[in-house]
């Protein structure tokens, strides 16, 4: 379809780099959540940091191109990186408007499918981009 994709946009304080240039921020009449209309893809992404007690959103926005996973209707995150011991970054890509607003489910930390606790470690800013 010719219509452009619209995604939730969020970047946690302290996250290095920005994906704001991948779209056009919309005026939605409310301060949060912010919406972004994608320029270069029809694909949204989300990144969550899962620790023992909670999942915290790190980034949400548009991808820079359509890639595998973008055909998904919903945000089904998969583990990507370990920013620090005891936490795991989960990312999703999906291809419907605002599909990155929330995830369908996250596996509990340390469950099968999540990288082992001895997996690669990275500084917080770097790990976001590893996840993307």
């Amino acid at each position: 379809p010719p219509n452009r994709r619209t995604c939730v946009f969020f970047e946690a304080p302290g996250v290095r780099g920005s994906t704001k240039t991948l779209g056009e921020l919309l005026d939605t009449g409310t301060e949060l959540p912010r919406a972004i209309r994608c320029l270069y893809s029809r694909c949204c992404f989300g990144i969550w940091n899962l620790t023992q007690d909670r999942a915290q959103v790190e980034m949400q926005g548009c991808r820079d191109s359509d890639e595998p996973g973008c055909e998904s209707l919903h945000c089904d995150p998969s583990p990507r990186a370990h920013p620090s011991p005891g936490s795991t970054l989960f990312t999703c890509s999906c291809g419907t408007d605002f599909c990155n607003a929330n995830y369908s489910h996250l596996p509990p930390p340390g469950s099968p499918g999540t990288p082992g606790s001895q997996g690669p470690q990275a500084a917080p800013g770097e790990s976001i981009w590893m996840a993307l």
Epitope: L26, D27, G29, A35, L39, Y40, D64
Partner: antibody
Framework: QVQLQESGPGLVKPSETLSLTCTVS?????????WNWIRQFPGKGLEWMGY???????SYNPSLKSRITISRDTSKNQFSLKLSSVTAADTAVYYC??????????WGQGTLVTVSS | DIQLTQSPSSLSASVGDRVTITCRAS??????????MHWYQQKPGKPPKLLIY???NLESGIPSRFSGSGSGTDFTLTISSLQPEDFATYYC?????????FGGGTKVEIK
């Protein structure tokens, strides 16, 4: 500031391939923006042809999709247009344009391409 | 594709006149209440110059006598007091859907 300049032959024979290059100065084409080709027919109508993004992805006008290729040379900070199987209907002024958003803030001066034998 | 129809196709006006140009889209160019319609000015031998983006936002460096309004399918470019340098052709452009399309232009001539 961002400056763009088109270059290429002003005369192309029917059925041949039109080739134009846009040289960008004052900004890296890999930093940001979509880098577009837009043409203006003698009757003054404007047509967006397509773009190559800062990351190298392309998007084309479906009316031209089978004939158009936009590519880039990052070492020269240039992007190029190739339009195959041209006819007299492709005679136009061809502009390159840079867009941070979905409107066109930066334009080259344009180059007239005539398709004639 | 979204068709944009501008009216009038040409008009004659005098310096100091208030000029209104309209652009009608074949379907809505709004996304969640945001209008993706833009306006350009073109003088002979020159490329188009951006005046207004997203229906009503004045591009940096453009005089405040230019303004834009509208939503959905109907949009207006207004020049509140026409100046000698404003005699030119004006185009609308939509970017709500691919491919981006332009209106046919409105030529503003000296009366």
């Amino acid at each position: 500031q961002v400056q763009l300049q088109e270059s290429g032959p002003g005369l192309v024979k029917p059925s041949e391939t039109l080739s134009l290059t846009c040289t960008v100065s004052g900004y890296s084409i890999t930093s940001d923006f979509a880098w577009n080709w837009i043409r203006q027919f003698p009757g003054k109508g404007l047509e967006w042809m397509g773009y190559i993004s800062f990351s190298g992805s392309t998007s084309y006008n479906p009316s031209l999709k089978s004939r158009i290729t936009i590519s880039r040379d990052t070492s020269k900070n240039q992007f190029s247009l190739k339009l195959s199987s041209v006819t007299a209907a492709d005679t136009a002024v061809y502009y390159c344009a840079g867009s941070r958003y979905s409107w066109f803030a930066y334009w080259g001066q344009g180059t007239l391409v005539t398709v004639s034998s | 594709d979204i068709q944009l129809t501008q009216s009038p196709s040409s008009l004659s006006a005098s310096v100091g006149d208030r000029v209104t140009i309209t652009c009608r889209a074949s379907e809505s160019v709004d996304t969640y209440g945001n209008s993706f319609m833009h306006w350009y000015q073109q003088k002979p031998g020159k490329p188009p110059k951006l005046l207004i983006y997203r229906a009503s936002n004045l591009e940096s460096g453009i005089p405040s006598r230019f303004s834009g309004s509208g939503s959905g399918t109907d949009f207006t470019l207004t020049i509140s007091s026409l100046q000698p340098e404003d005699f030119a052709t004006y185009y609308c452009q939509q970017s709500n859907e691919d491919p981006y399309t332009f209106g046919g232009g409105t030529k503003v001539e000296i009366k």
